[in-house]
Interface confidence: low
């Protein structure tokens, strides 16, 4: 029967003589006159069994004491802790020459747990043990006893077990306790990886590499490894595990996130409170659900609040200038909780008689700076038709508008364009050139913007640089310009007029009159 004694967590005791109740019953050789089992009191006045020998008067002592068989339990190296007293030979009169102050420690590996005899030749010597501080017995009555403690190790061991033996060669010794143990690195959790009880290696310098296994609800980041050192200490942790999404580290474990909390990824972060406008109803949430009417954009992190589309822009003002419209507005009262707000312009052309019959304006209308994705709160719309009803909608949009589009997100205004001057004439041609005249013809403007009342032709000698020009007006789309000088370059411009006024002049047409009577007929833009 063995009693329980407390030893370090990294030591596993195989034998403790002080925990044995009753006689130890180890084998001594010789049976008589050598080692003797004796009861003494320990430092706590508890009776313990010891082995003593004190044959210091006789020469050539060779007294052996052998333990029972000790299982090694898979250990390759074991440690022997011996607590003993050793009489100082100087304190014993008349023993010079025969008294010794050392004893020898031996071991013998064996698979047989019932060997009955000591065979000295089978034992291998571990060490000669000497006291660090030999004691002199002063007063046996006051129970003062200087214990020497020596620890030796032996290995590598390979058999199922072993015997220890103590050889006395003529000392005065009391073995007070013998403890045999091996060292292990105890089960531990490091970096969320569990490392099992690991017996130390065979050599005093060896390191045993151990792979850890991730604790529940965690996963490897880098392969977790540690080294079990010969002294039973874990060394050099490498790699680690991370709590899975929905779990956080607490006291070396991965606990599920509480209700109302979440964790999106396998990281070493803690669970976070659900962002605004979201909630979780289960433990272990990896994301939070958005409240009704709130949304997350595809590229929104789980940590971002849920948001909603913006309200409509405010204070829309229009300013019509003939066939252009400038629109200006204010930001919505509610941006939906997002920064990525922008504006889209929708243009509809509506009939004068029935405003409900509207069609998209088409590609001929131009928007400055752009029609969609506007970051500013103003836009200029040009190239509209004159005397036409237009409805413009300004939509406020953000990253979640697509999840819940609603008319509440836009504001509109209806305008009528004014009469506008005609556009410029695209093509002017010289149809006939003589020494004194040029016959011109041109096309109607692309956008007359009303009834063309007349055309105005402006011309001048090229050398005069428009300082002295003449005007000819005509209702037709052609005219003969007469009274010109021969062999002279002229520049011609044509523009149209409506009730709204003149349009822009055409691009210049340069023509040189002839030097001979014959006529040159052509339709190029430049005739010579």
């Amino acid at each position: 029967v063995t009693g329980s004694r407390v030893y370090p967590a990294n030591e596993v005791t195989l034998l403790d003589s002080r925990s044995v109740q009753g006689e130890l019953g180890w084998i001594a050789s010789p049976l008589e006159g050598g080692w003797e089992e004796v009861s003494i009191m320990d430092e706590k006045n508890t009776p313990i069994r010891t082995y003593q020998v004190c044959n210091v008067m006789e020469a050539s002592q060779n007294n052996w004491l052998r333990t029972d068989w000790i299982t090694r339990e898979g250990a390759q190296r074991v440690y022997i802790e011996i607590k003993f007293t050793l009489r100082d030979c100087n304190s014993l009169p008349g023993v010079m020459g025969t008294c010794k102050e050392t004893f020898n420690l031996y071991y013998y590996e064996s698979d047989n747990d019932k060997e009955r005899f000591i065979r000295e030749s089978q034992f291998g010597k571990i060490d000669t043990i000497a006291a660090d501080e030999s004691f002199t017995q002063v007063d046996i009555g006051d129970r003062i006893m200087k214990l020497n403690t020596e620890i030796r190790d032996v290995g590598p061991l390979s058999k199922k077990g072993f015997y220890l033996a103590f050889q006395d060669v003529g000392a005065c010794i009391a073995l007070v306790s013998v403890r045999v143990f091996y060292k292990k690195c105890p089960l531990t959790v490091r970096n969320l990886a569990q490392f099992p009880d690991t017996i130390t290696g065979a050599d005093t310098s060896s390191l045993v590499e151990v792979r850890g296994s991730c604790v529940n609800n965690s996963e490897e980041k880098d392969v977790p490894k540690m080294y079990c050192g010969a002294d039973g200490e874990w060394l050099v942790p490498i790699g680690n595990c991370l709590c899975n999404a929905g779990h956080e580290e607490q006291n070396g474990e991965c606990q599920a996130c509480k209700i109302g909390y979440y964790k999106a990824l396998s990281t070493d972060a803690s669970c976070a409170k659900c962002p605004p406008h979201s909630y979780s109803v289960w433990e272990g949430a990896t994301s939070c659900t958005c409240d009704r009417g709130f949304f997350r954009a595809d590229n929104d992190a789980a940590s971002m609040p849920c948001t909603r589309p913006p309200s409509a822009p405010l204070n829309l003002i229009s300013n019509v200038n003939e066939t252009s419209v400038n629109l200006e507005w204010s930001s919505p009262q509610n941006t939906g909780g997002r920064q990525d707000i922008s504006y889209n312009v929708v243009c509809k052309k509506c009939g004068a008689g029935d405003p409900s019959k509207c069609r998209p304006c088409g590609s001929g209308v131009h928007y400055t700076p752009q029609q969609n994705g506007l970051k500013t709160t103003r836009v200029s719309i040009t190239d509209l038709l004159a005397h036409t009803n237009y409805t413009f909608e300004i939509w406020a949009v953000n990253g979640v508008s697509k999840y819940n589009p609603s008319p509440d997100q836009s504001v509109s205004v209806t305008v009528t364009t004014n009469q506008a001057a005609p556009s410029s004439i695209a093509l002017v041609q010289a149809k006939e050139v003589t020494r004194y005249s040029v016959a011109l013809a041109w096309l109607e403007p692309d956008r007359p913007n009303g009834v063309i009342l007349e055309y105005e032709v402006k011309y001048y000698e090229k050398d005069q640089n428009e300082r002295s020009y003449r005007i000819v007006r005509t209702a037709a789309r052609n005219t003969d310009i007469k009274g010109l000088n021969p062999l002279t370059s002229y520049v011609f411009h044509v523009r149209a007029r409506t009730a709204a006024g003149y349009g822009d002049f055409s691009e210049p047409l340069e023509v040189t009159t002839n030097t001979v009577p014959s006529r040159i007929i052509g339709d190029g833009a430049n005739s010579t």
Epitope: S121, Q122, G124, V154
Partner: antibody, heavy 124, light 107 residues
Framework: QIQLVQSGPELKKPGETVKISCKAS????????MHWVKQAPGKGLKWMGW????????TYADDFKGRFAFSLETSASTAYLQINNLKNEDTATYFC?????????????????WGAGTTVTVSS | DIQMTQSPASLSVSVGETVTITCRAS??????LAWYQQKQGKSPQLLVY???NLADGVPSRFSGSGSGTQYSLKINSLQSEDFGSYYC?????????FGGGTKLEIK
């Protein structure tokens, strides 16, 4: 590198004394005990005993008790074998060899380094 | 004392052959055995320790085996540099006796 260097050959007459040396280098002298091995001409190896380099305590095999003495000069990392009252049968080569001083299991017990040997010839 | 009986005492073989030398202890020596090779006029060199462990730098054609009282040294595909004498030695309680030796000669 680790080596054991032995003294040169000796020619002696019966009854004389010879002292041969074994100088260690390349390691801590007191970490290894020194052993002596005899090899008579054309014969095998015979273990003579050893000396504890820490304590200077010699141990002799039965056949080598009496006329043989092991000694040390620790400061010079040198072990000595002295044979007194030489006999013809002492004619042999004597080797020194080292082994770890403390026993840490059978896997570590072997003579890993030997001296080159010293030949002693005893002839009248 | 433990006696070590080595056999054969001598052996005449050709290069490329395989040879086995045996060593018997008078009692169980628990694999506490070493093998050495000795060339003429040289000191012994360690080949095998603890019965089966090959010493550093020893070619893999050498191998040791055995337990209890019976041990052997095997040399596969003998090379010319392998000729010489071979000795076993126990380390199980002093005196640490050697075997009588085996002389390996070229045929």
């Amino acid at each position: 590198q680790i080596q054991l260097v032995q003294s040169g050959p000796e020619l002696k007459k019966p009854g004389e004394t010879v002292k041969i040396s074994c100088k260690a280098s390349g390691y801590t002298f007191t970490d290894y005990s020194m052993h002596w091995v005899k090899q008579a001409p054309g014969k095998g190896l015979k273990w003579m005993g050893w000396i504890n380099t820490e304590t200077g305590e010699p141990t002799y095999a039965d056949d080598f008790k009496g006329r043989f003495a092991f000694s040390l000069e620790t400061s010079a990392s040198t072990a000595y074998l002295q044979i007194n009252n030489l006999k013809n049968e002492d004619t042999a080569t004597y080797f020194c060899a080292r082994i770890p001083l403390y026993y840490y299991g059978s896997r570590y017990w072997y003579f890993d380094v030997w001296g080159a040997g010293t030949t002693v010839t005893v002839s009248s | 004392d433990i006696q070590m009986t080595q056999s054969p005492a001598s052996l005449s073989v050709s290069v490329g052959e395989t040879v086995t030398i045996t060593c018997r202890a008078s009692e169980n020596i628990y694999r506490n055995l070493a093998w050495y090779q000795q060339k003429q006029g040289k000191s012994p060199q360690l080949l095998v320790y603890a019965a089966t462990n090959l010493a550093d730098g020893v070619p893999s054609r050498f191998s040791g085996s055995g337990s209890g009282t019976q041990y052997s040294l095997k040399i596969n595909s003998l090379q010319s540099e392998d000729f010489g004498s071979y000795y076993c030695q126990h380390f199980w309680g002093t005196p640490w006796t050697f075997g009588g030796g085996t002389k390996l000669e070229i045929k």
